[in-house]
Amino acid sequence: ILEAHYTNLKCRCSGVISTVVGLNIIDRIQVTPPGNGCPKTEVVIWTKMKKVICVNPRAKWLQRLLRHVQSKSLSSTPQAPVSKRRAA
């Protein structure tokens, strides 16, 4: 998916994916603007399948997703949790 490593610049992502991550599997998104020693915007997504990935901040699908998330009311009902026992 990506390569990521500790760098002197304090960036968390040294490689990103541009392929679409479905909204239905996203648990959490963090957008970190440039700063704190990292000169680029970083987008990290946590999935419901317990994965964490770095995503290209310029990907068109991500821009649409972020607009969708921002337009949702803060009081919207959270999605039902996924099945808790999984045959991995």
Partner: antibody
Framework: QVTLKESGPEILQPSQTLSLTCTFS??????????VGWIRQPSGKGLEWLAN???????YYNPSLINRLTISKDTSNNQAFLKITNVDTTDSATYYC??????????????WGQGVMVTVSS | DIQMTQSPSSMSASLGDRVTITCQAS??????LIWFQQKPGKSPRPLIY???NLANGVPSRFSGRRSESNYSLTISSLESEDMADYHC?????????FGAGTKLELK
């Protein structure tokens, strides 16, 4: 300082249930992204991932063993547990408790316990 | 399940040798691979993550490389403290799977 320590029976008989406990310190299973798992290693052989449990009680099992495995946790006492039912001699191994944290970069199994050696023998 | 085929299963080498261990993934794991080092009687520890990145405190003689579905761990100049078992792990998808391991011994 992160530490994990496994405990359980050193020896048990075929068809019995193996109960293992992992007691950890230096982190908690409460915060988002924290997980604990179990990995085993038969003597002189390779590693086999068994199960993971996460802060939100999400559980993942190795499908080859899913009908025999149960993983659970006691967050307030910093413990995780693994039960393996109906053991046989092929379950003899060193069992490791491991930590994973969903941070970027994601390095699963970043901390390991010292392991507990379990022998199944009649 | 993703199968990880690790080779060789064991090897002996001399101090100062260049040593390479490989793991082949049965499907695309997109760099989601970790190399662990396990010294005799000890627990494994992460050595290289995301196929090419050195974990904290790991000497620079260790390196990781990817060529399509083949992942390799290289020790550029073998030292006595490198005598250990080495394991690859794919974490692209559950169930996470390890290679069978490589035992590195002194010639």
């Amino acid at each position: 300082q992160v530490t994990l320590k496994e405990s359980g029976p050193e020896i048990l008989q075929p068809s019995q249930t193996l109960s293992l406990t992992c007691t950890f310190s230096g982190f908690s299973l409460s915060p988002y992204g924290m997980g604990v798992g179990w990995i085993r290693q038969p003597s002189g052989k390779g590693l086999e991932w068994l199960a993971n449990i996460w802060w939100d009680d999400d559980k993942y099992y190795n499908p080859s063993l899913i009908n025999r495995l149960t993983i659970s946790k006691d967050t307030s006492n910093n413990q995780a547990f693994l039960k393996i039912t109906n053991v046989d001699t092929t379950d003899s191994a060193t069992y490791y408790c491991v930590r994973s944290e969903l941070v970027m970069p994601y390095v699963p199994f970043d901390y390991w316990g010292q392991g507990v050696m379990v022998t199944v023998s009649s | 399940d993703i199968q990880m085929t690790q080779s060789p299963s064991s090897m002996s080498a001399s101090l100062g040798d260049r040593v390479t261990i490989t793991c082949q993934a049965s499907q695309d794991i997109e760099n989601d691979l970790i190399w662990f080092q396990q010294k005799p009687g000890k627990s494994p520890r992460p050595l290289i993550y995301y196929a090419t990145n050195l974990a904290n405190g790991v000497p620079s003689r260790f390196s990781g490389r990817r060529s399509e579905s083949n992942y390799s761990l290289t020790i550029s100049s073998l030292e006595s403290e490198d005598m250990a078992d080495y394991h690859c792990l794919q974490f692209k998808q559950y169930p996470y799977t390890f290679g069978a391991g490589t035992k590195l011994e002194l010639k």
